[in-house]
């Protein structure tokens, strides 16, 4: 008799794939454009990334540091009208992309939360949650919660409103903090909150430290759903050298939880390579004409157009990983087991019941390494086979689909491998 199948966990839409942040509509669209109507025209691109949700804005009216001239119910006319927003929502729904609205109040000002008028602002947020839920948004984001007085209490209240409307609605809180104590304290008192933080950006880009941060976080949060990113808003290139971008994409897509990216992460968008562009929101490089300021500054391989035509590009890797993440049970909701593979390496297994299993091996170092996979660290339910098929490598040159002997696994500098192997009873 075949063994009983493990009961599938209840999965919300944000469990099924990545979220994509567009914090600055103008920078995302470029060419002096940057409104909701223009964004609607980019939804096909978002579909091609296989992302499940779009975190948008803030787009509400906000006169810098003026609480009286901040209206969370009104869209800033520079971005469009309520009708444009409704139209965007409808189009996004048709493409199965959920829309999360950022309601960080004073996004143009010094202090995101008008620290001297917290109660006034909190009331505005409450009204806005109810208004935009009725309008059909799928969730909300609020950032810089480290500056929000009594954040935990307010978030609990806002979570109640959001979940009270529908269990299918999401509240995301963002912080620049990387303090695990504060993170865990907030998560303990706000059960279904999704939190983005700078926790992982402290990793110092080493395998041992990253492994330690990830496992510490997962052990501490237990079986609650979490999200993975390097910050609440910034690009991966703000924290990582170019040679580690592929490795981090592979890791973020294969850890248990929701990966959260900022627009441009999929192409390695780097403000430092675009003179005069703001670090927090550089112009998106759709093609070579997206940054006309300095002729020749942008080459084809830095753009969406150029990378779309190159199967070995970062964008192509992002699309493949996003696709795998959204359809493989072991990556959707599988168990996670990290184990030793040698200095500089971080390796783990994702597995769910009798479904295909995945092995991830990441070499954070700048020298090639032989992986000494310590299978003895793993529980019996997650044992390693002698060979596994190479699904993809972050570096070109490997033959995909070929079986690799796990005892003789060698990784190039900064290489990450995603291998698959079948369940064996």
């Amino acid at each position: 008799r075949a063994p009983r199948c493990r009961e599938l966990p209840a999965q919300k839409w944000w469990h099924t794939g990545a979220l994509y942040r567009i914090g600055d509509l103008q920078a995302f669209q470029g060419h002096g454009a940057g409104n909701l109507a223009g964004l609607k025209g980019r939804l096909d691109y978002l579909s091609s990334l296989k992302v499940k949700g779009l975190v948008l804005g803030p787009i509400h009216k906000n006169q810098k540091d003026d609480v009286a001239q901040t209206d969370l119910l009104q869209i800033d006319p520079n971005f469009g009208s309520k009708e444009d927003f409704d139209s965007l929502l409808q189009s996004a729904k048709k493409k199965s992309i959920r829309v999360i609205l950022d309601l960080t109040p004073n996004y143009r000002g010094e202090n995101s939360w008008f620290s001297t008028q917290v109660d006034t602002v909190a009331t505005k947020v409450k009204d806005a949650l109810e208004f935009w839920l009725q309008a059909g948004v799928d969730g909300f984001q609020v950032r810089d919660i480290e500056n929000l007085k009594d954040a935990s209490s307010f978030l609990a209240e806002w979570q109640n409103i959001t979940k009270g409307f529908s269990e299918d609605r999401l509240l995301i809180a963002g912080t620049n903090s990387s303090d695990l104590q504060q993170i865990l304290s907030l998560l303990e008192s706000n059960k279904d909150l999704l939190l983005t933080s700078s926790y992982l950006s402290d990793s110092g880009s080493t395998g041992e430290h990253t492994k330690s941060l990830v496992t510490q976080y997962l052990n501490a949060t237990g079986n609650r759903w979490c999200s993975w990113s390097l910050s609440q808003a910034r690009l991966l290139t703000s924290f990582l050298p170019a040679q580690l971008l592929r490795l981090y994409q592979l890791m973020l897509f294969t850890l248990p939880g929701t990966p959260v990216f900022s627009y441009g992460d999929e192409i390695g968008l780097d403000a430092a390579a675009l003179p005069g562009q703001p670090m927090e929101a550089p112009v998106m490089l759709w093609d070579e004409s997206s940054f006309p300021d300095i002729p020749g500054a942008v080459s084809a391989n830095m753009t969406v157009k150029g990378q779309s035509e190159d199967p070995g590009s970062l964008l192509s890797l992002f699309r493949r990983l996003s696709d795998q993440r959204s359809k493989e049970r072991s990556l959707l909701h599988g168990d996670f087991h990290a184990f030793s593979a040698g200095p500089g390496l971080f390796s783990y297994i994702r597995h769910w019941d009798q479904n295909e299993r995945f092995l991830v091996v990441l070499n954070f170092g700048d020298v090639g390494l032989s992986a000494g996979l310590q299978a003895s660290d793993l529980p019996a339910s997650a044992s390693l086979p002698a060979k596994a098929d190479l699904l993809l490598s972050t570096q070109p040159g490997r033959e995909e689909g070929s079986p690799l002997e796990l005892e003789r696994l060698k990784l190039e500098p900064h290489e990450g491998l995603l291998l698959r192997f079948p369940y064996a009873a």
Epitope: S153, T175, Q182, E188
Partner: antibody, heavy 119, light 107 residues
Framework: DVKLVESGGDLVKPGGSLKLSCAAS????????MSWVRQTPEKRLEWVAT????????YFPDSVKGRFTISRDNAKNTLYLQVSNLKSEDTAMYYC????????????WGQGTTLTVSS | DILMTQSPSSMSASLGDTVSITCHAS??????IGWLQQKPGKSFKGLIY???NLEDGVPSRFSGSGSGADYSLTISSLESEDFADYYC?????????FGGGTKLEIK
């Protein structure tokens, strides 16, 4: 109004033990991390312990690790500090304080309770 | 551990004066600093959190500034109730650490 009231301080011999308490009111106790901070007779401030809102995670400086235990009873709105294997350098005024939690960073303090370690 | 060097350790000023107290951290603390007030024989009161944010009920003559490793607390138009001890605290990294304190006395 937020109120924190410590109790339990006493004169204890070196090597002895004691349990300090802090009764909280005026806020949703279970939503906040809580900490103990001490002030030495020379008026120097030292962080002693922190516990997360649900009580699952605790943090200590090396100077008290293994000797002090922080706990909480959210149903009773009470924070505790169990101190043991006491040394003379533990002599101080012990304060209970709210935070650090996001947006709340040691914002409210109790009036303190005195612990004297002496033979 | 992060060392918080607070200066001056004591100062005297007159009513109506503006004074500044500084704290230097031994490494960058990304605005994860608070300022506390302790009146003689009393407990502590939070004044400023995250470098610049005023705690509830704190008069606007108190302000905080700084970035990286250097921060300051400024009190403008000193009033009689402001003469007290002031401490900075960093909560960027464990163990949380405090400055040595500044005693502000009336001239």
């Amino acid at each position: 109004d937020v109120k924190l009231v410590e109790s339990g301080g006493d004169l204890v011999k070196p090597g002895g033990s004691l349990k300090l308490s802090c009764a909280a009111s005026g806020f949703t106790f279970s939503s906040y991390s809580m900490s103990w901070v001490r002030q030495t007779p020379e008026k120097r401030l030292e962080w002693v312990a922190t516990i997360t809102s649900g009580g699952s995670y605790t943090y200590f400086p090396d100077s008290v690790k293994g000797r002090f235990t922080i706990s909480r009873d959210n149903a009773k709105n009470t924070l505790y500090l169990q101190v043991s294997n006491l040394k003379s350098e533990d002599t101080a005024m012990y304060y209970c304080t709210r935070g650090p939690s996001f947006g709340n960073y040691l914002d409210y303090w109790g009036q303190g309770t005195t612990l004297t370690v002496s033979s | 551990d992060i060392l918080m060097t607070q200066s001056p350790s004591s100062m005297s000023a007159s009513l109506g004066d503006t004074v500044s107290i500084t704290c230097h951290a031994s490494q960058g603390i990304s605005s994860n600093i608070g300022w506390l007030q302790q009146k003689p024989g009393k407990s502590f009161k939070g004044l400023i959190y995250r470098g610049t944010n005023l705690e509830d009920g704190v008069p606007s003559r108190f302000s905080g500034s700084g970035s990286g490793a250097d921060y300051s607390l400024t009190i403008s138009s000193l009033e009689s109730e402001d003469f007290a001890d002031y401490y900075c605290v960093q909560y960027a990294h464990f163990p949380y650490t405090f400055g040595g304190g500044t005693k502000l006395e009336i001239k």
